[in-house]
Interface confidence: low
């Protein structure tokens, strides 16, 4: 979590002198409570916006907007604390709007916004706006929170952001998978314009089950420049196990910009249509427990064979 680097952060508007400050997320009013505190924000809205850094990099940012309630408590409003919590890491970042003049009622409702929190693709955040000073212990809460899910790099606008492009989002492998005779799968995909290696991760499952019955990894060496954007064809030999018929093929690139952590693409081959009275699937021993998320170290099993070639 960080702030977009280059802009002078502004919160002043006509009728209000205001400055944006870094915050420890622990406002002084927590420690030294005040008797009179403002009411909570109204209509908190979080939207996905995009902003460029001075270097020209494009980042997704959280656009935070809220309004004030039309009550007398705005006379005691000294500012606001904006907090963004990344839910999977518990990382929190805060900034503080410090009002340098007192708010007055005017015809239009007071509205505030801030668009400088950089967010990560595919991550979920909790955004909180706390009016300051914070309430006394057991006082009515004067904050509003909303969760905000950032789209992943598949999203059209996200795809061209710097974090997504450095994860390989512009590469579209256009994977095709076909079942051949003699327990084989033919995998074809488009190589990217970088001399880097790829891994194909094959995981097979029984019909309607999520425990793998076969796993295999195949390594594809780095293509030569004349092979960039060409199709690479790989034939994978499957385990001859009755009922082990649903195959997930995942292609993991190792682009220089993301190495172990590049975006993976996958395709799935479904089991053939089941007859009315399906044969019972024989017992099998899963090679290991189902995948619980893609490890940045690769998964594999020592069985199965494969070969490949680049197709011109």
């Amino acid at each position: 979590l960080r702030l977009l680097d280059h802009r002078a952060l502004v919160c002043s508007q006509p009728g209000l002198n205001c400055t944006v400050k870094n915050s420890t997320c622990l406002d002084d009013s927590w420690i030294h409570p005040r008797n009179l505190t403002p009411s909570s924000p109204k209509d908190l809205q979080i939207q996905l916006h995009f902003a460029h850094t001075q270097q020209g990099d494009l980042f997704p940012v959280a656009h935070i907007e809220w309004t004030l309630q039309t009550d007398a408590s705005i006379l005691y409003l000294e500012g606001a604390e904006l907090s963004v919590l990344q839910l999977n890491t518990n990382e929190r970042l805060c900034v503080k709007f410090q009002f340098l003049s007192m708010l007055q009622h005017h015809r239009k409702r007071w509205r505030f916004s801030f668009s400088h929190f950089v967010v990560d693709p595919g991550q979920e955040y909790e955004v909180t706006v706390h009016h300051l000073p914070k309430p006394i212990p057991d006082g009515d809460p004067n904050h509003q929170s909303k969760n905000f899910l950032v789209p992943d790099c598949e999203h059209a606008r996200m795809k061209v952001t710097t974090p997504c492009m450095s994860s390989g989002s512009l590469w579209d492998p256009n994977i095709t998978v076909e079942t051949l005779e003699a327990h084989q799968l033919r995998v074809s995909f488009t190589l990217w314009n970088e001399s880097t290696h790829y891994q194909i991760l094959l995981t097979s499952f029984p019909h309607m089950e999520n425990h793998s019955c076969f796993e295999h990894m195949h390594h594809i060496p780095a293509p030569r420049p004349e092979e960039f954007h060409q199709r690479s064809n790989v034939t994978l030999t499957l385990r001859n196990l009755k009922g082990c018929c649903r195959h997930q093929v995942q292609i993991q690139p190792f682009f220089s910009s993301c190495l172990n952590d590049c975006l993976r693409h996958s395709a799935t081959v479904s089991c053939p249509e089941m007859p009315d009275t399906p044969e019972p699937i024989p017992d099998y021993m899963p090679l290991w427990e189902p995948r619980s998320g893609s490890s940045d170290y690769k998964d594999d099993d020592d069985k199965g064979s494969s070969h490949h070639h680049h197709h011109h």
Epitope: N88, D120, D261, S294, S295, D296, K298, D300, D302
Partner: antibody, heavy 118, light 107 residues
Framework: EVQLVESGGGLVQPGGSLRLSCAAS????????MNWVRQAPGKGLEWVSF????????YYADSVKGRFTISRDNAKNSLYLQMNSLRDEDTAVYYC???????????WGQGTTVTVSS | DIQMTQSPSSLSASVGDRVTITCRAS??????LAWYQQKPGKFPELLIY???TLQSGVPSRFSGSGSGTDFTLTISSLQPEDVATYYC?????????FGPGTKVDIK
């Protein structure tokens, strides 16, 4: 020069907390997954925790699950290990280590010593 | 979880001897295995990855072999500077367990 430098070790009482840091330099830290590995006095290596480059994947050894938290700040080229509810058996030299594309860990820090004792 | 075992736990050999250390995984891990050397008071150093690929800068007297569950680290001609403890580590999926180590010294 590719370098990892750990800090934050020290003497702490059982039940106490420590935060270890690992400062990376000489490579694009934000592109690499990272690990913490520890070694108790006179014992072997024990893998402790893993975090992927964008913090999207995190793993812990069973022995530290629920007590230790791994995190990173790519803007600061830093890796962290927050250690709570420390026990005598957490006494060890703690190393941060960078995984190599293709496997294994090819860059290690010099280690920082954590002693848990009353 | 997959367990890693090493044998022997320690060995003494003469300079110039061929030394073999074995590492066994309780389940198949393909070639997702690394070998490390750790000298007393130092941090570990990667010797071999992908079971048999020599890490850059490592002397050619070190070699690795094996796939699936059984792996071997061989020092073709033991040198005084090879006195160390050697560890294997699996990295196919978490936990990324190390073997208990094999201590090598000179007779």
């Amino acid at each position: 020069e590719v370098q990892l430098v750990e800090s934050g070790g020290g003497l702490v009482q059982p039940g106490g907390s420590l935060r270890l840091s690992c400062a990376a330099s000489g490579f694009t830290f934000s592109s690499y997954s990272m690990n913490w590995v520890r070694q108790a006095p006179g014992k072997g290596l024990e893998w402790v925790s893993f975090i992927s480059a964008r913090s999207s994947t995190i793993y812990y050894a069973d022995s530290v699950k629920g007590r230790f938290t791994i995190s990173r700040d790519n803007a600061k080229n830093s890796l962290y290990l927050q250690m709570n509810s420390l026990r005598d058996e957490d006494t060890a030299v703690y190393y941060c280590a960078r995984p190599k594309v293709g496997g294994g860990m090819d860059v290690w820090g010099q280690g920082t010593t954590v002693t848990v004792s009353s | 979880d997959i367990q890693m075992t090493q044998s022997p736990s320690s060995l003494s050999a003469s300079v110039g001897d061929r030394v073999t250390i074995t590492c066994r995984a309780s389940q198949g891990i393909s070639n997702y295995l690394a070998w490390y050397q750790q000298k007393p008071g130092k941090f570990p150093e990667l010797l071999i990855y992908a079971a048999s690929t020599l890490q850059s800068g490592v002397p050619s007297r070190f070699s690795g072999s094996g796939s699936g569950t059984d792996f071997t680290l061989t020092i073709s001609s033991l040198q005084p500077e090879d006195v160390a403890t050697y560890y294997c580590q699996k990295y196919n999926r978490a936990p990324f367990t190390f073997g208990p180590g094999t201590k090598v010294d000179i007779k």
